[in-house]
């Protein structure tokens, strides 16, 4: 059973979210569960470090994009939000919070501002921003 959920503040159009936890989960209360991942969008604007701390306090991390297929709902995300991607100046790579390197062709990274942190924007775009800029953020938790 699928529920057609239209979350006007989060998505550009209707997205299909499973109704029962037998398909997905468990997730913290009021989080979105989709293809074995739990997501929550936080409206308060924080810098990257504060956003990371907020996610960690909920046993989660900032959004990690690892698969366009498993995370296809991210295509439709409205606006732009902090994700867990940081630039490592020493080797020039982009790295997730868990230390893994951004896979090629997963995100279109565009330099909107001089900075070492990245915002997630719809259709798998990453916007480079100054880490101290306040923005909304997305936390993510992998289900077991």
């Amino acid at each position: 059973i699928w529920s057609a959920v239209f979350l006007n503040s989060l998505f550009n159009q209707e997205v299909q979210i499973p109704l029962t936890e037998s398909y997905c989960g468990p997730c913290p209360k009021n989080w979105i569960c989709y293809k074995n991942n739990c997501y929550q969008f936080f409206d308060e604007s924080k810098n990257w470090y504060e956003s990371q701390a907020s996610c960690m306090s909920q046993n989660a991390s900032l959004l990690k994009v690892y698969s366009k297929e498993d995370q296809d709902l991210l295509k439709l995300v409205k606006s732009y939000h902090w994700m867990g991607l940081v630039h490592i100046p020493t080797n020039g790579s982009w790295q997730w919070e868990d230390g893994s390197i951004l896979s090629p062709n997963l995100l279109t990274i565009i330099e909107m501002q001089k900075g070492d942190c990245a915002l997630y924007a719809s259709s798998f775009k990453g916007y480079i921003e100054n880490c101290s800029t306040p923005n909304t953020y997305i936390c993510m938790q992998r289900t077991v």
Epitope: S45, K78, S79, Y80, T108, I109, I110, E111, M112, Q113, K114, S122, S123, K125, Y127, E129, N130, T133, P134, N135
Partner: antibody, heavy 115, light 108 residues
Framework: QVHLQESGPGLVKPSETLSLTCTVS????????WSWIRQPPGKGLEWIGH???????NYNPSLKSRVTISVDTSKNQFSLKLSSVTAADTAVYYC?????????WGQGTMVTVSS | EIVLTQSPGTLSLSPGERATLSCRAS???????LAWYQQKPGQAPRLLIY???SRATGIPDRFSGSGSGTDFTLTISRLEPEDFAVYYC?????????FGQGTKVEIK
Amino acid sequence: QVHLQESGPGLVKPSETLSLTCTVSDDSISSYYWSWIRQPPGKGLEWIGHISYSGSANYNPSLKSRVTISVDTSKNQFSLKLSSVTAADTAVYYCANWDDAFNIWGQGTMVTVSS
Amino acid sequence: EIVLTQSPGTLSLSPGERATLSCRASQSVSSSYLAWYQQKPGQAPRLLIYGASSRATGIPDRFSGSGSGTDFTLTISRLEPEDFAVYYCQQYGSSPWTFGQGTKVEIK
């Protein structure tokens, strides 16, 4: 679809400050980055700068010392201020939103710098 | 900054013909972050192509983009009367974002 409308004086005196506002037709001000681009008569396009809804701005270095872009999310507007203008700043000024590129543009407003 | 040079400056063609417009960058444009715009007299530019080869929403398939690195091409497979206009390329791989000087496609 979002619609953009520039407004402001069409004539500015040399050494004064040019001020323009772009009004966004819906509440999408928090969904995109917002840009200003200009085009002198009979010439090409020049990117001035852009701003996020949170106020983080990036400017063209050639104009950085004179330009300020600001945003007012409560009014669904963003603004351009260009100080110490000269005749070389005479141009059509466009506002645009940034998504995959400059996707949607205002119709443009002509600003003449003359005494 | 990256300087974009478009050629030719003017292209004189007849409706139904193929138009090939070139945009050359002074240094490599990272990840093919190049867009093409069409501008008609008295109008704002309109986005045609982004990411060097992706068509923007509502753009007819007679418009196609290609290229990478420093050399990019916009092709109009069969010119329609409404395609006669000025075309600009723009890079967004490196700040400051820059435009080419434009190519005018006029009726022969």
